[in-house]
């Protein structure tokens, strides 16, 4: 996900940094700007129930992390749900995973000092054909 | 996703903050700590092709954002793929979306000053029944 080291023409109005480790340590404004004004997250919220690979959402809370609450998907079945509402064991429900960035308090319990951390979260599930290895 | 305002016992070794807006503006170390050492991201990399609701991945690049590269899923079909490899008109491929946090350079082009931003990304696709039949 992360591509670092891009050279950006510097804006003369940028804050100055006297940090010896600059640009490893940066200032971050935690007033979140939400770019999702046009989207309605409620609209896709029932997919977890209507999918052929349905999932449950589990709350993962960690006060040392920002955001402190993350929802993790766990597939309900190993197989997928067929048209009759039964589990089809010829197909597999699998989690779709994504690496996301979070802020980890460092040193621990510090309210204003963080380190960037990459974590893998399961966002939902999809139904896939299993890989069958044919023996010669 | 975000739950703020948790009271944390302060570590006496924390950096001092003289920022008037504290704790709105915090210090973040960009040396990413990767918690995913036990996982093999390659393992889920072919789900996009094997799913009954397959998707393509599109590169979204923005040098003013950190991470600058994010991959967006676009469902290949409107319907889902059946066992014969043909479309099933009775089922729909839909994107699974997740709100993630990114860092936006603010003011623009500044290498050491960011604002937290929430964006909605499509991570993959799942196959859903279009109509939920409500029983009276």
């Amino acid at each position: 996900i992360v591509k670092a080291g891009i050279t950006i023409p510097r804006n003369p109005g940028c804050p100055n940094s006297e940090d010896k480790n600059f640009p490893r340590t940066v200032m971050v404004n935690l007033n979140i700007h939400n770019r999702n004004t046009n989207t309605n997250p409620k609209r896709s919220s029932d997919y977890y129930n209507r999918s052929t690979s349905p999932w449950n959402l589990h709350r993962n809370e960690d006060p040392e992390r920002y955001p402190s609450v993350i929802w993790e998907a766990k597939c309900r079945h190993l197989g997928c749900i067929n048209a009759d509402g039964n589990v089809d064991y010829h197909m597999n429900s699998v989690p779709i995973q994504q690496e996301i960035l979070v802020l980890r308090r460092e040193p621990p319990h510090c309210p204003n000092s963080f380190r960037l951390e990459k974590i893998l979260v399961s966002v939902g599930c999809t139904c896939v054909t299993p890989i069958v290895h044919h023996v010669a | 996703i975000v739950k703020a305002g948790i009271t944390i016992p302060r570590n006496p070794g924390c950096p001092n903050s003289e920022d008037k807006n504290f704790p709105r503006t915090v210090m973040v170390n960009l040396n990413i700590h990767n918690r995913n050492t036990n996982t093999n991201p390659k393992r889920s990399s072919d789900y996009y092709n094997r799913s009954t609701s397959p998707w393509n991945l599109h590169r979204n690049e923005d040098p003013e954002r950190y991470p600058s590269v994010i991959w967006e899923a676009k469902c290949r079909h409107l319907g889902c793929i059946n066992a014969d490899g043909n479309v099933d008109y009775h089922m729909n491929s839909v994107p699974i979306q997740q709100e993630i946090l990114v860092l936006r350079r603010e003011p623009p082009h500044c290498p050491n000053s960011f604002r937290l931003e929430k964006i909605l990304v499509s991570v993959g696709c799942t196959c859903v029944t279009p109509i939920v039949h409500h029983v009276a």
């Epitope: - | 079909h77 409107l78 059946n82 014969d84 043909n86 479309v87 008109y89 009775h90 729909n92 109509i131």
Partner: antibody, heavy 120, light 107 residues
């Protein structure tokens, strides 16, 4: 230039049969979903049949299911609609239409239509 | 089947007017909506798909909006060639269904 040309319409008695054809040109026919849509005189549009790019998937609404059959011959760039057990309410202009994708969900090109009249 | 209700069924407007046509689905159709224009004796012509995506070659005075069950086609400044009948079509749940049409006439 994309062109769809329907033929085979005409007057038929109730209970009779008719086969419509749609000749496609100006695009790679075998990669597009196709549909038949009809319009009764002075009325709105109604889906009749859908077929995906290779003919492996089809769909019919209840109003024609069991009486109409959609097929395609990709080697001849032609779409067909076989209509059996025709009824007065099947009277309409029949359009063939192309989906911009593989499957047949919405329609970016339409033919000029062929009129089917079911009457005794 | 999903019912598509278009309103108004007809309207009279003048060249230069802003015209709005609405389409209501009986269930959420998740933005899977197309708009067509049909002139007398002609086949329909696709204007918009995915509720908001304008087809190439369609003038920018046409725009689609909406979500859930409610969708709108707007013509920002009506031109002489826009007098026609407009249909919406959902493609979320088979059978795909069309609205009853809105006839835009010259005032």
């Amino acid at each position: 230039e994309v062109q769809l040309v329907e033929s085979g319409g005409g007057l038929v008695q109730p209970g009779g049969s008719l086969r419509l054809s749609c000749a496609a040109s100006g695009f790679t026919f075998s990669t597009y979903g196709m549909s038949w849509v009809r319009q009764a005189p002075g009325k709105g549009l109604e889906l009749v049949a859908i077929i995906n790019h290779n003919g492996g998937s089809t769909f019919y609404p209840d109003s024609v299911k069991g009486r109409f059959t959609v097929s395609r011959d990709n080697s001849k760039n032609t779409l067909y609609l076989q209509m059996n057990s025709l009824r007065a309410e099947d009277t309409a202009v029949y359009y063939c239409a192309r989906d911009p994708r593989h499957d047949g969900y919405f329609f970016d090109y339409w033919g000029q239509g062929t009129l089917v009249t079911v009457s005794s | 089947d999903i019912q598509m209700t278009q309103s108004p069924s007809s309207l009279s407007a003048s060249v230069g007017d802003r015209v709005t046509i609405t389409c209501r689905a009986s269930e959420d159709i998740y933005d899977r909506l197309a708009w067509y224009q049909q002139k007398p004796g002609k086949a329909p012509n696709l204007l918009v798909s995915g509720a908001t995506s304008l087809e190439s070659g369609v003038p920018s005075r046409f725009s689609g909006s909406g979500s859930g069950k409610d969708y709108t086609l707007t013509i920002s400044s009506l031109q002489p060639e826009d007098f026609a009948t407009y249909y919406c079509q959902q493609y979320w749940s088979v059978p795909w269904t069309f609205g009853g049409g809105t006839k835009v006439e010259i005032k």
